[in-house]
Amino acid sequence: SETTTGTSSNSSQSTSNSGLAPNPTNATTKAAG
């Protein structure tokens, strides 16, 4: 069966199934090294 999980930040489809936020924020700190 075909999968059509919408993951676009401009899409009205759910982004949850991708496991990624619709517009991920930039991390506020950098890891050492």
């Epitope: 059509t4 999980t5 676009s8 489809q13 949850s16 991708s18 496991g19």
Partner: antibody, heavy 115, light 112 residues
Framework: EVNLEESGGGLVQPGGSRQLSCVAS????????MNWVRQSPDKGLEWVAQ??????????RYVDSVKGRFTISRDDSENTVYLQMNNLRAEDTGIYYC??????WGQGTTLTVSS | DVVMTQTPLTLSVTIGQPASISCRSS???????????LNWLLQRPGQSPKRLIY???NLDSGVPDRFIGSGSGTDFTLKISRVEAEDLGVYYC?????????FGGGTKLEIK
């Protein structure tokens, strides 16, 4: 059934170039963000690059360590995502996976950067 | 970058017994839409990673309900109520809230 098939890995000398490809089937490719993730014994799993949709103007993101060296692109008509890798370094060695997000993963293609 | 810390490094469990893996993030994974983009993957020996759980607690299709994801903010847990032989491999948490997406170092589940 969703299938992601990577190709293009191999042995490359430091400073060299390589292009990886990933062909997708079983899903509406044009509706998925596409990502490359790599895995090495040293660094474990590391997200490398992402390309979003036409409706997002094909927005692109890279991890800092590959910015300026790697270029991700996609061809929605061919259900294919590419990773052009230039100025390769030993630390780029690893298995490169094509993923839709965290949900679907290919089997990976192995890149070795060594002289 | 958001650092994902998994414990323990290795877990040796008897078949039929429970197992628990912890994942902590250096920043909250709660996104502005109220969802928390914390996912769990299993990499069986010689295979690519396969997702088990997305958005903290949602099981992927075909994943047995003995896998239970929980947590919030920066503190997450994957529990296996009764370990089976097919569960061996390396478990990873991965966050999708912040760029760059980051993975835990992995927890190797061994069968006693």
């Amino acid at each position: 059934e969703v299938n992601l098939e990577e190709s293009g890995g191999g042995l490359v000398q430091p400073g060299g170039s390589r292009q990886l490809s990933c062909v997708a089937s079983g899903l509406t490719f044009s509706k998925h963000w596409m990502n490359w993730v790599r895995q090495s014994p040293d660094k474990g799993l590391e997200w490398v690059a992402q390309i979003q949709l036409k409706s997002d103007n094909y927005a692109i993101r890279y991890v800092d360590s590959v910015k300026g060296r790697f270029t991700i692109s996609r061809d929605d008509s061919e259900n294919t995502v590419y990773l052009q890798m230039n100025n390769l370094r030993a630390e780029d060695t690893g298995i490169y996976y094509c993923t839709t997000g965290t949900d679907y993963w290919g089997q990976g293609t192995t890149l070795t950067v060594s002289s | 970058d958001v650092v994902m810390t998994q414990t323990p490094l290795t877990l040796s469990v008897t078949i039929g017994q429970p197992a628990s893996i912890s994942c902590r993030s250096s920043q909250s994974l709660l996104y502005s839409n109220g969802k928390t983009y914390l996912n769990w993957l299993l990499q069986r020996p010689g295979q690519s990673p396969k997702r088990l759980i997305y958005v903290v607690s949602n099981l992927d299709s075909g994943v047995p309900d003995r896998f239970i994801g929980s947590g919030s903010g920066t503190d997450f847990t994957l529990k296996i109520s009764r370990v089976e032989a097919e569960d061996l491999g390396v478990y990873y948490c991965v966050q999708g809230t912040h760029f760059p997406y980051t993975f835990g170092g992995g927890t190797k589940l061994e069968i006693k």
